[in-house]
Amino acid sequence: MGRARDAILDALENLTAEELKKFKLKLLSVPLREGYGRIPRGALLSMDALDLTDKLVSFYLETYGAELTANVLRDMGLQEMAGQLQAATHQGSGAAPAGIQAPPQSAAKPGLHFIDQHRAALIARVTNVEWLLDALYGKVLTDEQYQAVRAEPTNPSKMRKLFSFTPAWNWTCKDLLLQALRESQSYLVEDLERS
């Protein structure tokens, strides 16, 4: 989980300001699958790439969100970008961190955890990353992973690196991250829960 979200975010971040505006306008009229609602216009037009990714995944979940994003990109004439997005969402995930049992490949696809649902917003808005790392060290993160995250220069890049490990995490690993977030930045968790 999180791979499709990454791919959506990468695609949207590669759009120019004008292209992103055009993407949002097309999103307001693109045909939707039955049972899916439309992101409200007022909220949509003011979003940056991070917020829009978060909203796409919360409204449409990862698989359909990526498909919808690719459809809009194609409609804009950005066939290559749409192809890259779809290719990226079909790649396999990495190995599990030490001490964490990866789910068997035959397992049913688990539901979307808060951590996955709000990945983009967490990357953008978490400030107390060092505290999170200390809380997760030895439980979820190996020493190598811990050092790799700490080596990143900014909070968003630290969080992006941290999220590069989450596809291999199980539900309880994600819960430990969420617990740490609730303890260090409760207002952020509460705000995202309301969104």
């Epitope: 049992q101 397992a107 049913a108 688990p110």
Partner: antibody, heavy 122, light 107 residues
Framework: EVQLVQSGAEVKKPGESLKISCKIS????????IHWVHQMPGKGLEWMGY????????MYNEKFQGQVTISADKSISTAYLQWSSLKASDTAMYYC???????????????WGQGTLVTVSS | EIVLTQSPATLSLSPGERATLSCHAS??????LSWYQQKPGQAPRLLIY???NLHTGIPARFSGSGSGTDFTLTISSLEPEDFAVYYC?????????FGQGTKLEIK
């Protein structure tokens, strides 16, 4: 309608093994955590841990870690709590419970089984 | 482990009166607190979650408030069926913990 139906009362001797169950219906079993809560006679509630059937990962209260095992069988939408060697102090009511919603891990228990009374006595 | 302390241990009131139950957390739990009602021989029932949200199907006479370390469950006008044991539970961190309970009895 969400339903959690637990197995019947058990009377066991110290040292015996036991596995109690919680059969779930009314929602997708793999999308929600199932928790176990312990209540000794005339006492308060104590959270033991949970299983997330989607990936079979479990979280335990350290007090119960190594004392019990929480598991699930996706094919029959059933969660289990088991002991390999019961003690007299394990005598209690055991409830399975499902949160209001799991994605944010705010574990407010909106749905409960009827409870399984376990009595351990020589 | 976060310890929740409920007070009073027992509260004796009459139907129609207002009941105020307290729950104190040993450390800051923000708004991650819920309240349950339990009657003899029954499983607990969720009343309030996230400090002040009323669970579906729960009468409006129940309300919750508080944040940080101090929380209150209020029953505005007691009905005969409200006499039971009430527990608070924190969802801030593991292990999840419950208070020891407040027994609400008929005076």
């Amino acid at each position: 309608e969400v339903q959690l139906v637990q197995s019947g009362a058990e009377v066991k001797k110290p040292g015996e093994s036991l596995k109690i169950s919680c059969k779930i219906s009314g929602y997708s079993f793999t999308d929600q955590t199932i928790h176990w809560v312990h209540q000794m006679p005339g006492k308060g509630l104590e959270w033991m841990g949970y299983i997330y059937p989607g990936d079979s990962s479990a979280m335990y209260n350290e007090k119960f870690q190594g004392q019990v095992t929480i598991s699930a069988d996706k094919s029959i939408s059933t969660a289990y709590l088991q002991w390999s060697s019961l003690k007299a102090s394990d005598t209690a009511m055991y409830y399975c419970a499902r949160p209001l919603y799991s994605y944010a891990s705010y574990y407010w228990f909106a749905y409960w089984g009827q409870g399984t009374l376990v009595t351990v006595s020589s | 482990e976060i310890v929740l302390t409920q007070s009073p241990a027992t509260l004796s009131l009459s139907p129609g009166e207002r009941a105020t139950l307290s729950c104190h957390a040993s450390q800051n739990i923000n708004v991650w607190l819920s309240w349950y009602q339990q009657k003899p021989g029954q499983a607990p029932r969720l009343l309030i979650y996230k400090s002040s949200n009323l669970h579906t199907g729960i009468p409006a006479r129940f309300s919750g408030s508080g944040s940080g370390t101090d929380f209150t469950l209020t029953i505005s006008s007691l009905e005969p069926e409200d006499f039971a044991v009430y527990y608070c539970q924190q969802g801030q961190s593991y292990p999840l913990t419950f208070g020891q309970g407040t027994k609400l009895e008929i005076k």
